[in-house]
């Protein structure tokens, strides 16, 4: 009988820890989700507020239409620059008429005066074709003038009023673009 | 801390097809671009293709016409299309995100072998 009593004691003892352990558990996980929640809570308190003081271009970019524009102030070859673009969450600068054209090659005169920018077209290796780097092609009165007789890569570039093109190992400056924010007011 | 996770990689015929995944997870509410990079054995890694929060996309010249990269709407799944695939394809393919503080993280890495 008294052996019946201490197997029932050392039960019952045994889910009294449990319980405990349970009841540790759920106040953890509340105690996370509460900073979770806080943390949600900070962080769409931050995107409303500056979604709601944001202009549609970030800091120290241009914007013209739907596009905004970034100048840079350093120098790379043309893969890197591609990347310095990605890392900005844009591509390089794909001129879509003679109207872009025209606004990149005034803010640049305003800017920084006549020197080399690479923009995002290359010439296929194979075929010859120039293609900017979302595949599609430029149109007719946006093809690089003929000035590399380089062998290795060619890529484009934008000086003056011009689009030429060079070896895609030269350093130049370089013009990223992306979308400008639309307003929601 | 944020973490790739690429699949889809194997062997394919030469003139095949195939499509990459890759899965963005952790500490990750956006980005400012995800793409793919590829290093074939004794080269430099390579950019690919990629696409910005955005939307805008961009391709290495090997790529264009032939691979596609697209973006699930939960915006943290990067998917690269190859088809037409060639010898000089076969690599190691990576993923990789550029976050909004402008750091950048890379996947393990998925193997692509094209060969008959």
């Known amino acids: 009988k008294l052996l019946q009593v201490s197997t029932i004691a050392m039960q019952q003892q045994e889910k009294l820890i449990q319980q405990e352990r349970a009841l540790l558990n759920f106040t953890e996980w509340k105690r996370s989700c509460a900073l979770q929640m806080k943390y949600c809570q900070a962080f769409m308190q931050n995107s409303l507020s500056s979604a709601h003081n944001s202009s549609p271009c970030p800091n120290n970019w241009i914007q013209n239409r739907e596009s905004c524009y970034y100048v840079s102030e350093i120098w790379s070859i043309w893969h890197t620059s591609q990347e310095n673009c990605l890392k900005e969450g844009s591509t390089l600068l794909q001129i879509e008429s003679k109207e872009e054209m025209d606004f990149i090659t005034g803010s640049l005169r305003k800017i920084k005066g006549s020197y080399d920018y690479w923009v995002g077209l290359s010439q296929d290796g194979h075929s010859g074709r120039w293609l900017w780097q979302d595949g599609s092609s430029p149109s007719p009165g946006l093809l690089p003038a003929e000035r590399s007789q380089s062998a290795n890569q060619v890529c484009g570039y934008v000086k003056s009023n011009s689009l030429l093109s060079s070896n895609c190992s030269t350093w130049k400056y370089f013009i990223c673009e992306k979308y400008a924010l639309r307003s929601s007011v | 801390q944020v973490q790739l996770q690429e699949s889809g990689g194997g062997l394919v015929q030469p003139g095949g097809s195939l499509k990459l995944s890759c899965a963005a997870s952790g500490s990750i509410f956006s980005f400012n671009a995800m793409g793919w990079y590829r290093q074939a054995p004794g080269k430099q890694r390579e950019l690919v293709a990629a696409i910005t929060d955005g939307g805008r996309l961009t391709y290495a010249d090997s790529a264009k016409n032939r691979f596609t990269i697209s973006r699930e709407n939960t915006r943290n799944t990067v998917h690269l299309q190859m088809s037409s695939l060639k010898a000089e394809d076969t690599a190691v393919y990576y993923c990789?995100?550029?976050?909004?503080?402008?750091?950048?993280?890379w996947g393990q890495g998925t193997q692509v072998t094209v060969s008959s």
């Open positions: 990789t995100i550029w976050t909004k503080d402008r750091q950048q993280y």
